[in-house]
Amino acid sequence: SSPCPQAWGPPGVQYGQPGRSVKLCCPGVTAGDPVSWFRDGEPKLLQGPDSGLGHELVLAQADSTDEGTYICQTLDGALGGTVTLQLGYPPARPVVSCQAADYENFSCTWSPSQISGLPTRYLTSYRKKTVLGADSQRRSPSTGPWPCPQDPLGAARCVVHGAEFWSQYRINVTEVNPLGASTRLLDVSLQSILRPDPPQGLRVESVPGYPRRLRASWTYPASWPCQPHFLLKFRLQYRPAQHPAWSTVEPAGLEEVITDAVAGLPHAVRVSARDFLDAGTWSTWSPEAWGTPSTGTIPKEIPAWGQLHTQPEVEPQVDSPAPPRPSLQPHPRLLDHRDSVEQVAVLA
């Protein structure tokens, strides 16, 4: 058997660190057998069999010029083997970031914090953490570890399925190369990393007869599981074309009527979502949808201009107990509390 331990990586390659002493090992001889060393394709003897170093070649303070292929020969001139030297660095702790688009699963991505220049792989696992005792603030790793399955095709991402929303997890991402391993531990709670995908299917429609109104409607992101206990709230922004500033409202459901649109101008609208109890952060904005208020047909029964009702329209209030989390159903409404005076009068 070879006297040379095989480091992780391609066969026949040995590894070292720039600026450090590097030992190359002749693979095809018995440990301690004296050998001669040459650079591949060069006749010059690098180290003779009388060096006292047996089957090893020592390179002091290796640098990039030392990288390449070496040949070792036994005393009788037989080929002891070829060795390729590759220089690089031990792993540094990777940087890890975790995110959740729903309350049942989360994914973690990682990236090296320093490029080692060597073949590298990553080991990914996680534990669920539990509180030690009812009064204790300390948490300790308790269950697991379980593998965090990595994406195929080599993407630097792994996914934890079936996570518990109220639990805390410790993610372990270990960078491994032939010179060692380095581990990043990251504590993650689903509540803090939750960021829904943006709402889908945003539509903006005019409201016939109301030249300052637009009705926007949307749906939950497809990635959000439809269970009544974990709902989303929404934030809607709108602005007329060429206006730099957005107006922001927080709709009560899956629809919103904008009542202060600028008549005749197209408006951009976008929506964002967040867990209803403010876990995590707001989603990114949905793609913008555009709509233009209707030109407005004047009602037949028009009073004299002096009798115009110019107070803001008010949606009738209904006293009902609010559930802790609202229904998934949209809350349709045409008028809302922010109604403003419109160009076309409405009968009182």
Partner: antibody, heavy 118, light 107 residues
């Protein structure tokens, strides 16, 4: 010579923007994580933001999150910090610093002064 | 975030004195602690990394020790050129934090 050289500082009004640059030389820039650290006049050091070698992961201090953006151009050996919605409390000398790894800083630039004042 | 505290905030010592600065982390940071020296008007300089490792080119009179939450930085024999502010900094977390600094001057 191994060095980092910051530029782009200056006087800006509250709410304004600045873009800092850090030119690296003498080492393989694309191998290392890079960081911005700041120091308000007469105060201590405050980590601002870091970016990994490939540029695909970044991290920010809470005090600048959503306002500052770190980026890098490995082909130009340059690190950037885009600073928007600047506040008086962002007034500081901004240093660019190099890894090893993430969170250790073995090479620093001389710094560039950013003053936010009306 | 992990909070770092340093003591004392300032000290005066004579040339040749042994100087000790302590740094405490608000939670366990293993040995992920660095020490920096900053002279007036200059950028900081890394002296000690990972609690006890001397950075290349740094004089051996500087040393560090500790792990977990409590760390110590020592100048075995204070020299005039050591007048500076010294900062500890943790990198256990992906959001590094610095201590408030200790100003060292000569009596």
């Amino acid at each position: 010579e191994v060095q980092l050289l910051e530029s782009g500082g200056g006087l800006v009004q509250p709410g304004g923007s600045l873009r800092l640059s850090c030119a690296a030389s003498g080492f393989t820039f694309s191998t290392y994580s890079m960081t911005w650290v700041r120091q308000a006049p007469g105060k201590g050091l405050e980590w601002v933001s870091s970016i990994v070698p490939y540029g695909d992961l970044t991290q920010y201090a809470d005090s600048v999150k959503g306002r500052f953006t770190i980026s890098r151009d490995n082909s130009k050996n340059t690190l950037y910090l885009q600073m928007n919605s600047l506040r008086a409390e962002d007034t500081a000398v901004y240093y660019c610093a190099k890894g090893p790894g993430w969170g250790s800083f073995d090479l620093w630039g001389r710094g560039t002064l950013v003053t936010v004042s009306s | 975030d992990i909070q770092m505290t340093q003591s004392p905030s300032s000290l005066s010592a004579s040339v040749g004195d042994r100087v000790t600065i302590t740094c405490q982390a608000s939670q366990d940071i293993n040995n992920y602690l660095n020490w920096y020296q900053q002279k007036p008007g200059k950028a900081p300089k890394l002296l000690i990394y990972d609690a006890s490792n001397l950075q290349t080119g740094v004089p051996s009179r500087f040393s560090g020790s500790g792990s977990g939450t409590d760390f110590t930085f020592t100048i075995s024999s204070l020299q005039p050129e050591d007048i500076a502010t010294y900062y500890c900094q943790q990198h256990e977390s992906q959001s590094p934090t610095f201590g408030p600094g200790t100003k060292v001057d000569i009596k």
